[in-house]
């Protein structure tokens, strides 16, 4: 799996999308987990409704929400009030029994809020897009990691 980078601004919301084959993953619940270290386990953050037919209902765990368009094949995770400690490697997963298939590996990067750091110089931050379900503005941009890029910094 390639890793997709999603960048968001601290204090704002970041929306992560994970497309998948709706027929291949029919009837399967989904989850969002955080990778603990390069070879560590993926720790569950939030999962979709325990009734698959209600997967579109937004489920929250703290500031993280998940919702699944099972017909369209898109899992959406919202990280509300993004903080620096939210940065890291995550996975979108499709669950079957005690097993989990990785739908997408995601690297979340948190950018400083330029309003809080006016001397940040040429700090780049993404454009705005209106969220359908919430009145607040979502910031997100994604790219795939280039070959050779490492999602985790080397440990000494």
């Amino acid at each position: 799996h390639n890793t997709t980078v999603f960048q968001g601004v601290a204090g704002q919301s970041l929306q992560v999308s994970c497309p998948y084959d709706s027929m291949k993953h029919w009837g399967r619940r989904k989850a969002w987990c955080r990778q603990l270290g390069e070879k560590g386990p993926c720790q569950r953050v939030v999962s979709t409704h325990n009734l698959w037919l209600l997967s579109f209902l937004r489920r929250w765990n703290g500031s993280t929400a998940i919702t699944d368009d099972t017909l369209g094949g898109t899992l959406t995770i919202t990280l509300r009030n993004l903080q620096p400690h939210d940065a890291g490697l995550y996975q979108c997963q499709s669950l079957h029994g005690s097993e989990a298939d990785t739908l997408r590996k995601v690297l979340v990067e948190v950018l400083a809020d330029p309003l809080d750091h006016r001397d940040a110089g040429d700090l780049w931050f993404p454009g705005e897009s209106e969220s359908f379900e919430d009145a607040h503005v979502e910031h997100s941009i994604s790219r795939s990691l280039l070959e050779g890029e490492i999602p985790f910094p080397p440990t000494s």
């Epitope: 409704h49 325990n50 579109f56 017909l71």
Partner: antibody, heavy 126, light 106 residues
Framework: EVQLVESGGGLVQPGRSLRLSCTAS????????MSWFRQAPGKGLEWVGF??????????EYTASVKGRFTISRDGSKSIAYLQMNSLKTEDTAVYYC?????????????????WGQGTMVTVSS | DIQMTQSPSSLSASVGDRVTITCQAS??????LNWYQQKPGKAPKLLIY???NLETGVPSRFSGSGSGTDFTFTISSLQPEDIATYYC????????FGGGTKVEIK
């Protein structure tokens, strides 16, 4: 008039089977999730299970106590939802209701049930 | 499973009284809660969905509020035809009902 009518209830011995029917009229049956509930004599309401709209291809969900014994199905051409009950137990004795899930859009619905049938009594006894 | 504790289990009030029923969830259920009315020998009737939305055709004296774990159902002015048992139903995790509140006229 939007209506649901259950049928098929009756007296049955433990371990036997029974099939309930829920005939819908007055609305586009294929567009709605359909659910079954039950109410034991003098008790509260209990969700049994439901089946998704046609878009969800007959996918079903059940409460733990009936999983593996009960099966919900639907026939869009007849606008009928079924509850097939196998290996019946005395604790399955109840009035069984079918109900329609409230629909928001093609994809979204809410498990609020806005149309109910009159109910059919199922008695499991030897 | 999520437990729904409904209170009181029964109440007696006069016509015109304001009646309040509460439903407490054993964990946060957002606003994933509905309220039903059931008259003796009849099927339940949906009154309120998603905690606070009044179902079409339901009189405006019925209302619902709350989010998280604590929810309230109110009849602003009790009418004789409101004699029934009222149930809350959550759908945050599976579907479960409260034990019901039987409303009678004094």
């Amino acid at each position: 008039e939007v209506q649901l009518v259950e049928s098929g209830g009756g007296l049955v011995q433990p371990g036997r089977s029974l099939r309930l029917s829920c005939t819908a009229s007055g609305f586009t049956f294929d567009d709605h999730a359909m659910s079954w509930f039950r109410q034991a004599p003098g008790k509260g309401l209990e969700w049994v299970g439901f089946i998704g709209s046609k878009a969800y291809g007959g996918t079903t969900e059940y409460t733990a106590s009936v999983k593996g014994r009960f099966t919900i199905s639907r026939d869009g051409s007849k606008s009928i939802a079924y509850l097939q009950m196998n290996s019946l137990k005395t604790e399955d004795t109840a009035v069984y209701y079918c109900a329609r899930g409230k629909r928001y859009s093609y994809t979204y619905w809410t498990p609020a049930f806005d149309v109910w049938g009159q109910g059919t009594m199922v008695t499991v006894s030897s | 499973d999520i437990q729904m504790t409904q209170s009181p289990s029964s109440l007696s009030a006069s016509v015109g009284d304001r009646v309040t029923i509460t439903c407490q969830a054993s964990q946060d259920i957002t606003n994933y809660l509905n309220w039903y009315q059931q008259k003796p020998g009849k099927a339940p009737k949906l009154l309120i969905y998603d905690a606070s939305n009044l179902e079409t055709g339901v009189p405006s004296r019925f209302s619902g509020s709350g989010s998280g774990t604590d929810f309230t159902f109110t009849i602003s002015s009790l009418q004789p035809e409101d004699i029934a048992t009222y149930y809350c139903q959550q759908y945050d995790s599976y579907l479960t009902f409260g034990g019901g509140t039987k409303v009678e006229i004094k």
